[in-house]
Amino acid sequence: LNTTILTPNGNEDATTDFFLTSMPTDSLSVSTLPLPEVQCFVFNVEYMNCTWNSSSEPQPTNLTLHYWYKNSDNDKVQKCSHYLFSEEITSGCQLQKKEIHLYQTFVVQLQDPREPRRQATQMLKLQNLVIPWAPENLTLRKLSESQLELNWNNRFLNHCLEHLVQYRTDWDHSWTEQSVDYRHKFSLPSVDGQKRYTFRVRSRFNPLCGSAQHWSEWSHPIHWGSNSSKENPFLFALEAEQKLISEEDLGGEQKLISEEDLHHHHHH
């Protein structure tokens, strides 16, 4: 498994203490070498990856990771039970949901087992390191002749998230952006009927439940077009095979629905 090292923009409060043996200035020992920084991210509060750059070690070293929660009932030191590897050398640790306590100070310690005095400890606020899954099930509704409403879903973390919507037309050279609060819906008040539109959304664990800096991946794009019903009522599909039903079929509202619903709709 090749682990990706992400940059932690989101943890201003992280502190690092290096416990190193002092050595005479004219001699260099492995124990004076700083250990790589550990970077942790909590993915949708389902699991957490804490990774480090194993290639920064002067020679391949299987560093070990221990963790605990400061000043809490979970302050017992735990060994990593699921290491991540990069070219057969430890480069991370994966913690499962039951081992994650977002609102307690997480302490992580990296150690060189061949040189036990060579260790580094970091304290992290996990609520600032949450990365949600990309929004899904994007749907578009025509509210009026010139107004579109975009809706989407997030798995599990709904009220904790803020969102960023990007949209563009086939005439545009750049995205237009709009921030959206926890309500996960966006209205475009003025739609040009001659243009095609593309929308995408990403989400962030901020500000109600944490102060994360990292956004989710972008959703799959969703498309809306001027003559979609005329050319083909099932044009402008979501990449996940979602299709448009024409206005007449939905009593005046255009909406994107799934392939399964589409089949059901035409048989009843």
Epitope: Q166, D170, K195
Partner: antibody, heavy 116, light 108 residues
Framework: EVQLVESGGGVVRPGGSLRLSCAAS????????MSWVRQAPGKGLEWISS????????DYADSVKGRFTISRDNAKNSLFLQMSSLRAEDTALYHC?????????WGQGTLVTVSS | DIQMTQSPSSLSASVGDRVTITCRAS??????LNWYQQKPGKAPKLLIY???SLQSGVPSRFSGSGSGTDFTLTISSLQPEDFATYYC??????????FGQGTRLEIK
């Protein structure tokens, strides 16, 4: 007159790094997302990366993801491409272009050669 | 990823000829298609965007048409300065943005 002028290309060994710059003038820089598009010698155009107007989001081609980083400085009307872990197949003329998916203006390009 | 295929790969024509270059997408891209012209040693130049809209400053002898998967670039009366390589490019499903392999237009 719109001008995009790239710099920073050169010869580098495999595994090495380079930082390309693009200086923009003649248009309102922060009204545009910006992109890098490359062209290997005698070959066609390949999109590499785009960044939005305020620098808050970026997209990358799979061929460079994790190795290249696009950034911009709107105060200085400048676009950048930090390239690391360079490979022989990255050898190309690198153009900066205005827009994220429709490229209205292009620079003449800066040549990057990756060779041992 | 969406693949863009241009045809022909190269063609020879004479000044005054009407020339058509086609571009086919591997799936529907609506009208999210742009055309560029590139002359040797020069940067590409945007000709047509949104399949059929002429970029400002581009001569009216250039036109684009098509929607869905099939698109054409037409030069109604070829001029000496039009001999170049032409590329189509889709921006419907991004990333990645993808270009056709190019069509080289040469003097007969």
């Amino acid at each position: 007159e719109v001008q995009l002028v790239e710099s920073g290309g050169g010869v580098v060994r495999p595994g090495g790094s380079l930082r390309l710059s693009c200086a923009a003038s003649g248009f309102t820089f922060d009204d545009y997302g910006m992109s890098w598009v490359r062209q290997a010698p005698g070959k066609g155009l390949e999109w590499i990366s785009s960044i939005n107007r305020n620098g808050g989001s970026a997209d990358y081609a799979d061929s460079v993801k994790g190795r290249f980083t696009i950034s911009r400085d709107n105060a200085k009307n400048s676009l950048f491409l930090q390239m690391s872990s360079l490979r022989a197949e990255d050898t190309a003329l690198y153009h900066c272009a205005s827009g994220e998916f429709r490229f209205d203006y292009w620079g003449q390009g800066t040549l990057v050669t990756v060779s041992s | 990823d969406i693949q863009m295929t241009q045809s022909p790969s190269s063609l020879s024509a004479s000044v005054g000829d009407r020339v058509t270059i086609t571009c086919r997408a591997s799936q529907s891209i609506s009208s999210y298609l742009n055309w560029y012209q590139q002359k040797p040693g020069k940067a590409p130049k945007l000709l047509i965007y949104a399949a059929s809209s002429l970029q400002s400053g581009v001569p009216s002898r250039f036109s684009g048409s098509g929607s869905g998967t099939d698109f054409t670039l037409t030069i109604s009366s070829l001029q000496p300065e039009d001999f170049a390589t032409y590329y189509c490019q889709q921006s419907y499903s991004t990333p990645p943005i993808t270009f056709g392999q190019g069509t080289r237009l040469e003097i007969k």
